[in-house]
């Protein structure tokens, strides 16, 4: 080994070196939280970049760059260090126009903490292992969601466009002419029935057990879907999103009520099956796999 390499190894294995890097990262994180940093922080930035460069140089000199089994770039954690340094120099010395987008990558410096704190490294390792193990469960989940999304598509396509429409049209007004002239929400409220405090027109359906319109209104299928058009079963992708919402129970009761009002109460069976299978079974299966992965990592 050359003297330079010997010195590099000594520095690398020294506890003070790890301490210095950890303190640098934490200080850097504190500086990154500043809203309007003063001008002198620019010099501090250069110092941080210098320390990170020094750290990487020490690692490269001690372990080698990329040829060989235990070299710098063979360790995935060092990829992060490398990217941090590259972006530091890019944003500082290269004029790339929209630099603010590149500055975002400075946040990656905070992730360096993981590689420095041993306990954290183990946990993240376990997390990565669990993601690998999750692949089968994920395939099963996507498959189940897809099947139910297709069922939802067949059952409820277009149903959430049903609205309660005012009966008393003017002599020459048609649905089309009205829809073409409606611009503001106030215009919509003139022709469609809205419950107090509601952003969307009252949903209704054509089956006997679906929601009925109040007196003076009739059910028509026109306009956009509820929630600014984001809630629907009109295409496979929207249906899939709706099913994902049910699985994660993200304000699912609203979707449930909207669909039952538009399609009919019988379809509650669909929601019961999806909630039991998707929300109770699949979610817990995912948690079980993650728990197993952590257990394996600990052993």
């Amino acid at each position: 080994f050359s003297p330079l390499r010997r010195i590099s190894i000594k520095i690398l294995v020294h506890s003070l070196f790890s301490m210095l890097i950890m303190c640098t990262i934490l200080t850097n994180c504190i500086f990154m939280t500043m809203n309007n940093p003063p001008d002198w922080t620019k010099n501090v930035e250069y110092t941080f970049t210098g320390i990170y460069t020094f750290e990487s140089l020490v690692k490269i000199l001690a372990r080698g760059f990329c040829v060989g089994e235990f070299t710098f770039l063979r360790d995935p954690w060092n990829w992060l260090d490398f990217v941090v340094i590259v972006f530091a120099y890019l944003t500082e010395f290269v004029n790339l126009g929209n630099v603010s987008a590149l500055r975002t990558f400075r946040v990656l410096r905070a992730l360096k903490t993981i590689s420095v704190i041993p306990g954290l490294k183990t946990i993240v390792g376990a997390l990565i292992q669990s993601v690998k193990k999750l692949s089968d469960v994920m395939i099963l989940t996507v498959f189940c969601l897809s099947v139910f999304a297709l069922i939802g598509l067949q059952l409820f396509m277009g149903n959430l466009k049903h609205k309660c429409f005012r009966n008393s049209l003017e002599n020459n007004e048609t649905l089309e002419s009205i829809m073409n002239t409606l611009e503001s929400e106030e215009d919509f409220r003139k022709y469609f029935y809205y419950l107090e405090g509601s952003k969307d027109a009252l949903l209704c359906g054509f089956s006997t057990d679906s929601g009925q319109c109040p007196e003076g209104y009739t059910c028509v299928k026109i306009g956009r879907n509820p929630d600014y058009g984001y809630t629907s079963f009109d295409t496979f992708s929207w249906a899939f999103l709706a099913l994902f919402r049910l699985m994660t129970q993200d304000y699912w009761e609203n979707l449930y009520q909207q669909t039952l009002r538009a399609a009919g109460k019988t379809y509650m069976i669909f929601f019961v099956v999806v909630i039991f299978l998707g929300s109770f079974y699949l979610i817990n299966l995912i948690l079980a796999v993650v728990a197993m992965a952590y257990e394996e990592q600990n052993q």
Epitope: M157, F165, N167, C213, G216, T218, C219, V220, K221
Partner: nanobody, 120 residues
Framework: EVQLVESGGGVVQPGGSLRLSCAAS????????MAWYRQAPGKQRELVAY??????ISYADSVKGRFTISRDGSKRVYLQMNSLRPEDTALYYC???????????????WGQGTLVTVSS
């Protein structure tokens, strides 16, 4: 393609009666509101009466008590016209808000019109 076909028009004496009928032909998933309109020569088209699936019925003031709108099933609507007057002379149109199939939006459909002439 959905079509509305009117029938029952003709010439009648003042005080007489006529029964207009309108039927929707072609594929119809759902009919929401069916109505009768009329257009007298040189005048604007005006609403005579309408009926909704829930049974809401409304008449123009000029025909209240004389005309009766009814719906038979989901595809057919009638207009029973009694005590006809010369001012009732017009081309009577049938109009429906309907959905041709479950994937289509509700649209407005018009019939071609049937002529009612009231004269002595």
């Amino acid at each position: 393609e959905v079509q509305l076909v009117e029938s029952g028009g003709g010439v009648v004496q003042p005080g007489g009666s006529l029964r207009l009928s309108c039927a929707a032909s072609g594929p119809v998933f759902n009919i929401n509101r069916m109505a009768w309109y009329r257009q007298a020569p040189g005048k604007q088209r005006e609403l005579v009466a309408y009926v909704t699936p829930t049974g809401d019925i409304s008449y123009a003031d000029s025909v209240k008590g004389r005309f009766t709108i009814s719906r038979d099933g989901s595809k057919r609507v009638y207009l029973q016209m009694n005590s006809l007057r010369p001012e009732d002379t017009a081309l009577y149109y049938c109009r429906a808000l309907l959905q041709p199939d479950r994937y289509s939006n509700t649209r407005t459909y018009w019939g071609q019109g049937t002529l009612v002439t009231v004269s002595s």
